[in-house]
Structures are given as C-alpha cells and as structure tokens.
Amino acid sequence: SEVEYRAEVGQNAYLPCFYTPAAPGNLVPVCWGKGACPVFECGNVVLRTDERDVNYWTSRYWLNGDFRKGDVSLTIENVTLADSGIYCCRIQIPGIMNDEKFNLKLVIKPAKVTPAPTRQRDFTAAFPRMLTTRGHGPAETQTLGSLPDINLTQISTLANELRDSRLANDLRDSGATIRIG
C-alpha cells in the first residue's frame, strides 16, 4: 500500500524519497514516474538521474534537496487536481534485483478560498516555494494559510525561518529511505 501525501491546488507538493550513497559522490540512478512502480524503471517518467546528475526532467518537477547526498525527494510545482495519483520513486541499486521502489500517493485538495490582503498575495507571488513546509508525518502538509495580522517584517522573518528549517531531516524518519553499502 502507498503512503499518502497531501497538498492544496496551487501549492508545491513534496514527495520524500531518500537513500544513503555508499560513498560521497557514489550516486545511484533514480527515476520518478507518474503511476505505480512497474517491474523495471518507472512508467511515464517525469524525472531521472544517473550516476552523476539529473539527466531528464519535465516542467514543474524538480529535486529541491541535495540529490548528491541521496535526497531525491520530488517537488511538484503549483499542483492542480490532475497531479493527484500514485508516483513511483525507484532507486536503481546495482546488482541482481536490488533496486528499491516506493509508491507514494499524492492527494490534491481544492484550495481554500479565503479573502486575503493584497500584500499577502504579493508575498505569495514573490516567495511561492516558501508557502509549503514539510510536515513531520507522511500525510502532513503545513501551510501558512491566511496571514491577515502579520506585518511585512514578520513575514520576512517567517520566510527566513521556513527557508532555514530542517524539517526535511525529520522526514527521513517517515519517508522512503534506503541505505546503500
């Protein structure tokens, strides 16, 4: 069964997937695909890495973490309802039938319609990737939501805190993680 992750329309969705390289820079090919993991590789590939670099990606799909350290978590930008479904993260560990595959279910909820001051909308446009933080649990998505009482200084401070947060480390306890070597 798949672990479930949630995001709202217009947000960035985050699907965690990690492995620990056997040695620094000793990378393993990884693919992300839309649809459950098949026998080989990924179906409907949206992003792919080889032993050196990201060698294929499609618009709105990117690796936000340090994939050279094994953080191959997928970020999907500005999600729509059509992005709902199963995603496959496959870590293609060398050897006979060694690779690891993880099916992650993404549930997209309609955006909450809440009137907001113009300045918040400007903030959203200026810092779109900071609006979604990563929760401690696999099905958790934290958002700033409506911020009518926060002034621009507070917003700037909050944005910096979000940017500097290390919640991704917490996700290693609940996301798809595999140690190699």
């Epitope: 649809g35 409907n44 032993e51 050897g95 039938m97």
Partner: antibody, heavy 125, light 108 residues
Framework: EVHLVESGGGLVKPGGSLKLSCAAS????????MHWVRQAPEKGLDWIAY?????????????YYADTVKGRFTISRDNAKNTLFLQMTSLRSEDTAMYYC?????????????WGQGTSVTVSS | QIVLTQSPAIMSASPGKKVTLTCSAS???????LYWYQQKPGSSPKLWIY???NLASGVPARFSGSGSGTSYSLTISSMEAEDAASYFC?????????FGGGTKLEIK
Amino acid sequence: EVHLVESGGGLVKPGGSLKLSCAASGFTFSDYGMHWVRQAPEKGLDWIAYISSGSISSDSSTIYYADTVKGRFTISRDNAKNTLFLQMTSLRSEDTAMYYCARHDWRGLYGMDYWGQGTSVTVSS
Amino acid sequence: QIVLTQSPAIMSASPGKKVTLTCSASSSVSSSYLYWYQQKPGSSPKLWIYSTSNLASGVPARFSGSGSGTSYSLTISSMEAEDAASYFCHQWSSYPPTFGGGTKLEIK
C-alpha cells in the same frame, strides 16, 4: 534509425554453453535498459532477462532474470561497444528458441519498443 | 506470476469484419503496463499498442485497445489482409513480466 542485430546462436549439446550478442545502433545505447526475450518454435514469447542502462559504467546496472534461467544465464553490456550480451550455460533442450534482444524505453511509455531480428539457438544431442 | 490467457488461440475473419481479441489476466494488471505486440511469420514482434489503448507509431487507426484490471482487448474495426498475424498481450506491471500465448489471426 534504431537497429538491433543479434548473433552467436547455433547448435549446442545439452549442458553446453553459448554467448549471444546484440549490436545496437541508431540510438544512444547507454541511455537504455535492454531485454532478452525468447520464443520456442511455434510458441509464445518468454521474457528472460533485463539490464538497466548503467550509463556511466556497466557495473552500475540493475539486473533482472526469469526464474527459469536464474543461475544459468548472465546478461551484461558493453556501453563503449554498444553491445548487449547473454552468456548461457548448462543449456537444456527447453532452451531451444529464437532469442531476441529488445530495447526498453526509459521514458516508461513504450516498454520494449524495438526488437532485433533474432538469433536461433538449438540445444540437442 | 501473472498468467495472461488469450482467446481465441486461432481465428479467421473476412475482410471488412470487426475482430476482437481478448487477454485475461490471472490477477489485476495496471492498465499503464498492458501492451500488445504484432508478429508476422519470420519476423520479430512489433510494438502495436501501449498502455492498454495507445497505438504505436504507424499502427492503422482501425486498431484500438481497451480494458482494465484483469480483462483487456484489442479490436480491429474492419479487418484487412495485412492484419493477418499473431498478436501477443504483455504485462510489465509485476514481476516477472509475462506474455500471453498469442492469438493467430488469419484472413478468410
């Protein structure tokens, strides 16, 4: 144009060995996973092995085998020479078949999208 | 392993007739990973339909594919002589990947 050409087939006695090759051209071989599939005379298709791209070195490939050939057959590739191999040992009469190599579409849409013309293997005393 | 059973094993159809070939799986197969191949005598298999219903490049529009779960089919809306061939369904949804036994389609 994608081109796959198998070679190395022939007549071999039970218990014997044979090494098949598949020469690839018309595409970036190191980007693609590859399969071996066989077809016994007047029979259906039988998948036997797969090797992932291993684009930087063939040591980095992920490999899958059918249970019927596990421990007897070895799939490998030489990306520098654009060639896929199938080393077959401890051959049995039931291994008699036409052996095809096939390319696996890494985008995950077309599966085994191109096949070679095949090389015939006959295991008989 | 998933066993794919194709029926009929052999069938003949007159030109212009509608033809339906079926592929039944012993357990559920993701429609994304159910494929069909065409093979003519003396030739290697050719990808014909991918992801249940998508026609491969060069396949005539009279062909179509459908299905889900354990039941899939390939349909020819109007049989033509060049369609005489063997057709194999194939799944790579779960290990090991398997093929159906094939349907040999002949022209009357």
